[in-house]
């Protein structure tokens, strides 16, 4: 399955939108900084078969979509930017789902991939827990926005590596 060029453009658009969504200066949030321990090894396309990498990407985008689809998220961000951002993520999910169906038929996804998906889920659990502990404060959301920008950048890089493998 070849991810369309529009997919990587969508990822870039999502990054730009997320960059524009900031409503508070990060420089006023230095006390709220947090280490979410992003599972970097899950974004290393070299150790994965293509089907595994695509399912990890799918999980990453799905969890991001879920995070920004909550009521608390709606209250935190400017509505039109949030809607555009969610639309970009939804389109990426559709692209990836088509690929997941195609690729899993080609190669069986080993148990190792379940560990990778679990690592991504735990990462998002840490993010959600942080927001709860910080009572969804503006600075907590700003810290999470910065973190998701980084994870989306990692996703973009993994997609680039996948295209180079094709």
């Amino acid at each position: 399955c070849d991810l369309p060029q529009t997919h990587s453009l969508g990822n870039r658009r999502a990054l730009i939108l997320l960059g524009q969504m900031g409503r508070i200066s990060p420089f006023s949030c230095l006390k709220d900084r947090h280490d979410f321990r992003i599972p970097q090894e899950e974004f290393d396309g070299n150790q994965f078969q293509k089907a595994q990498a695509i399912s990890v990407l799918h999980e990453m985008i799905q969890q991001t979509f879920n995070l920004f689809s909550t009521e608390d998220s709606s209250a935190a961000w400017e509505q039109s930017l949030l809607e555009k951002f969610s639309t970009e993520l939804y389109q990426q999910l559709n692209d990836l789902e088509a690929c997941v169906i195609q690729e899993v038929g080609v190669e069986e996804t080993p148990l190792m991939n379940e560990d990778s998906i679990l690592a991504v889920r735990k990462y998002f659990q840490r993010i959600t827990l942080y927001l709860i502990e910080r009572k969804y404060s503006p600075c907590a959301w700003e810290v999470v926005r910065a973190e998701i920008m980084r994870s989306l950048s990692f996703s973009t890089n993994l997609q680039k590596r996948l295209r180079r493998k094709d």
Partner: antibody, heavy 123, light 112 residues
Framework: EVQLQQSGGDLVKPGGSLKLSCAAS????????MSWVRQTPDKRLDWVSI????????YYPDSVKGRFTISRDNAKNTLYLQMSSLKSEDTAMYYC????????????????WGQGTSVTVSS | DIVMTQAAFSNPVTLGTSASISCRSS???????????LYWYLQKPGQSPQLLIY???NLASGVPDRFSSSGSGIDFTLRISRVEAEDVGAYYC?????????FGSGTKLEIK
């Protein structure tokens, strides 16, 4: 390959103005925060200003606040430093620097630096 | 502002032996998130500064593992296990815990 190409340094009289530029290439400029750091004649490094990736937020130390303005044009992949009301103590080599992707831990490590541009404030 | 203090010169070292450079901050750089926001930069003669160490003990990309760093939150040490001629230059510590970000005055590594 990440590159930061600087220009705009000059000899200027006290009270004068100057605009420095830093042209970026080899990376997605719009995804990274940027800073200006200066090196005084006694070789001390002095952080001057910072701007977020989208350009919405900036910060300055008291020594330059109200006199210096950091800005960026993401369409042109260029960072700027507008300096006005210059003083002799602003004489330095000015470097632009890219901030590493810090995520939620806001790691402002400066992982790439320009070659520097010299500013001399003297009558 | 957080003040970073460094000695102007290191003890002269022989090539192939180890060297240590110290830095002290006026306040603990250990954040409540567990990260110590202490950085080391090297400026080789005639060059721009380059990142060596981030978050107190992590090696920046492309930095040889001869370099290591440790500290307590206030006192920090950069170690070079086997000094090479290319390691000559000024070593700066810096903090990113609080704004304004501040640098030490730099320590010049001297070779015997």
């Amino acid at each position: 390959e990440v590159q930061l190409q600087q220009s705009g340094g000059d000899l200027v009289k006290p009270g004068g103005s100057l605009k420095l530029s830093c042209a970026a290439s080899g990376f997605t400029f719009s995804s990274y925060g940027m800073s200006w750091v200066r090196q005084t004649p006694d070789k001390r490094l002095d952080w001057v200003s910072i701007i977020t990736s989208g350009g919405s937020y900036t910060y300055y130390p008291d020594s330059v606040k109200g006199r210096f303005t950091i800005s960026r044009d993401n369409a042109k992949n260029t960072l700027y430093l507008q300096m006005s009301s210059l003083k002799s103590e602003d004489t330095a080599m000015y470097y632009c620097a890219r901030h590493a992707e810090g995520g939620g831990n806001y790691d402002y490590a400066m992982d790439y630096w320009g070659q520097g541009t010299s500013v001399t404030v003297s009558s | 502002d957080i003040v970073m203090t460094q000695a102007a010169f290191s003890n002269p070292v022989t090539l192939g032996t180890s060297a240590s450079i110290s830095c002290r901050s006026s306040k603990s750089l250990l954040h409540s998130n567990g990260i110590t926001y202490l950085y080391w930069y090297l400026q080789k003669p005639g060059q721009s500064p380059q990142l060596l160490i981030y978050q107190m003990s992590n090696l920046a990309s492309g930095v040889p593992d001869r370099f290591s760093s440790s500290g307590s939150g206030i006192d920090f040490t950069l170690r070079i296990s086997r000094v090479e001629a290319e390691d000559v230059g000024a070593y700066y510590c810096a903090q990113n815990l609080e704004l304004p970000f501040t640098f030490g005055s730099g320590t010049k590594l001297e070779i015997k």
